[in-house]
Interface confidence: low
Amino acid sequence: DAHKSEVAHRFKDLGEENFKALVLIAFAQYLQQCPFEDHVKLVNEVTEFAKTCVADESAENCDKSLHTLFGDKLCTVATLRETYGEMADCCAKQEPERNECFLQHKDDNPNLPRLVRPEVDVMCTAFHDNEETFLKKYLYEIARRHPYFYAPELLFFAKRYKAAFTECCQAADKAACLLPKLDELRDEGKASSAKQRLKCASLQKFGERAFKAWAVARLSQRFPKAEFAEVSKLVTDLTKVHTECCHGDLLECADDRADLAKYICENQDSISSKLKECCEKPLLEKSHCIAEVENDEMPADLPSLAADFVESKDVCKNYAEAKDVFLGMFLYEYARRHPDYSVVLLLRLAKTYETTLEKCCAAADPHECYAKVFDEFKPLVEEPQNLIKQNCELFEQLGEYKFQNALLVRYTKKVPQVSTPTLVEVSRNLGKVGSKCCKHPEAKRMPCAEDYLSVVLNQLCVLHEKTPVSDRVTKCCTESLVNRRPCFSALEVDETYVPKEFNAETFTFHADICTLSEKERQIKKQTALVELVKHKPKATKEQLKAVMDDFAAFVEKCCKADDKETCFAEEGKKLVAASQAALGL
């Protein structure tokens, strides 16, 4: 339904508070280096303009598209050329090319300072002095560091952030109340950002069909009692929501997400028995709850899949009549029966089924040709099962930190050209699969582990795309979305890699390491481990373990010394010499 003024329509639908928050997020995700005050000024100008359009939809410029209005506003930033370089060239383009240009310049790894958390009293004072500015600053800082963060979900995080400060700043022990809540929000936020980044990569790099296939599989697992037509409707609507958010259309995205939540709750009887509690919550909580809702129970009387998809003589006829609908039905039927499979595995099975039908429906005897198609699924199912079993055993044996180290070594040997910070970040996240998923029973391990690994490997892919250094990473990232994990798993030591020159400076440490948190200290040690492997890719596990044990002892010893800096200087030289000898550097 066309509106005379799109900006007035969205302002009325969303309300002033959400409108302003979403415009701030949109601007911060596009112009990631701009100061907070500049963004607030732009948002206020847009909001005042929107109000004039609400009062009179025929007023000047009110008929312009949101991209035109927002793009024009962004292009008024005086320092665009010196701050953003070639991004300023976007402003010479017309819509829709201008928006596409801004999207292409979003930076997954912006050169911004790490967010340092002030003292609790300082934060509480700032919160009480100006709550509105304090919360806007939160939106701004998250959005500019995570340019694909799911905007309506960020509003939910901001609501929780506000609630944490409201409660804890009047508690007897403010820090004990607030810090765990902030830690939880930070960790959940990073996870949410990474999950959304995969959705956007799926849409942008592999197209709408790939995203819809993912959504069919996931929603069919979650809502196995829903009819195929119902799942298809939800998939279409969900695809629209994520296409809008990934495309920077945050007002439309938030509005459509609210409509989808409303539809789901109005039709929960035909969707899932698990939605009741979610649907009693306010809007932001409701949408979040629906997105995280547990899988409904499978209907008890589901017939064998083989009847419709293998034994039927009409398989090729049904396939030819509407290929994507037939494949969608196959995926729906398979997924609703298999909450124990990862979404990516279900998509691999569907792809194998599609490939088989493509060749068999052109053969002389199609039925004989595709009769054994389900046999081809067995190795595809066993491969992730075996991999998860092996890695969970290793995780249980080593614990998270040492398991991360094993993955650090494994991935550095596979793709040693990748930057050390990226290898550390990605391997640490890969290693978290252990604590996250290995505690689950068998039936929940694979969907937990493999779908989580897809999210983490996408981080590697988007970071690598910014500065490509490895053909192997490019190949695994671009050839097939659903086969990324098997592709990386299949990589072995890169025999073409020329080891890095030894640089003693890389292994020189100072007393400041003693004041770091346990997590930061681990990152320092893991950074050194990656550098060691880059110098000596053929080093054995035993050699690397010996060096890392010596390193841990060295840090512990010097952090206990009276003259820490001298200890680090003198003992550090000995450690470097001993490590060189041990590894034959």
Partner: nanobody, 116 residues
């Protein structure tokens, strides 16, 4: 560029044996799982067997289990298929392919005919 060249096919009597080879070049062979697929006259492609990149895990279609053995030599960038107890229904063009069971062949293939 990626090249897969199959060889070793021929005419053999039922119960006989053949060893197929696939010489790979233009990609990091040691980094990828490999498969054999076949196409009988007038039929579609049928997956035969797969092996992981290191050679430690192997998979077979039920129709060849116990008769065929897949292996690889990463130092020679070569994939093998040892075929024993051949039957008339094994007659087909055999192709090697990069990847697991769903992999698509890109080479010319090698003809295997089992006939008395």
């Amino acid at each position: 560029q990626v090249q897969l060249v199959e060889s070793g096919g021929g005419v053999v009597q039922p119960g006989g044996s053949l060893r197929l080879s696939c010489a790979a070049s233009g990609f990091a062979f040691r980094g990828f799982g490999m498969s054999w697929v076949r196409q009988a006259p007038g039929k579609g492609f049928e997956w035969v067997s797969s092996i992981n990149n290191g050679g430690s895990d192997t998979y077979y279609a039920d129709s060849v289990k116990g008769r065929f053995t897949i292996s690889r030599d990463n130092s020679k960038n070569t994939l093998y298929l040892q075929m024993n107890s051949l039957r008339a229904e094994d007659t087909a063009v055999y192709y090697c392919a990069i990847g697991g069971p769903g992999a698509s062949p890109s080479g010319q293939g090698t003809q295997v005919t089992v006939s008395s």
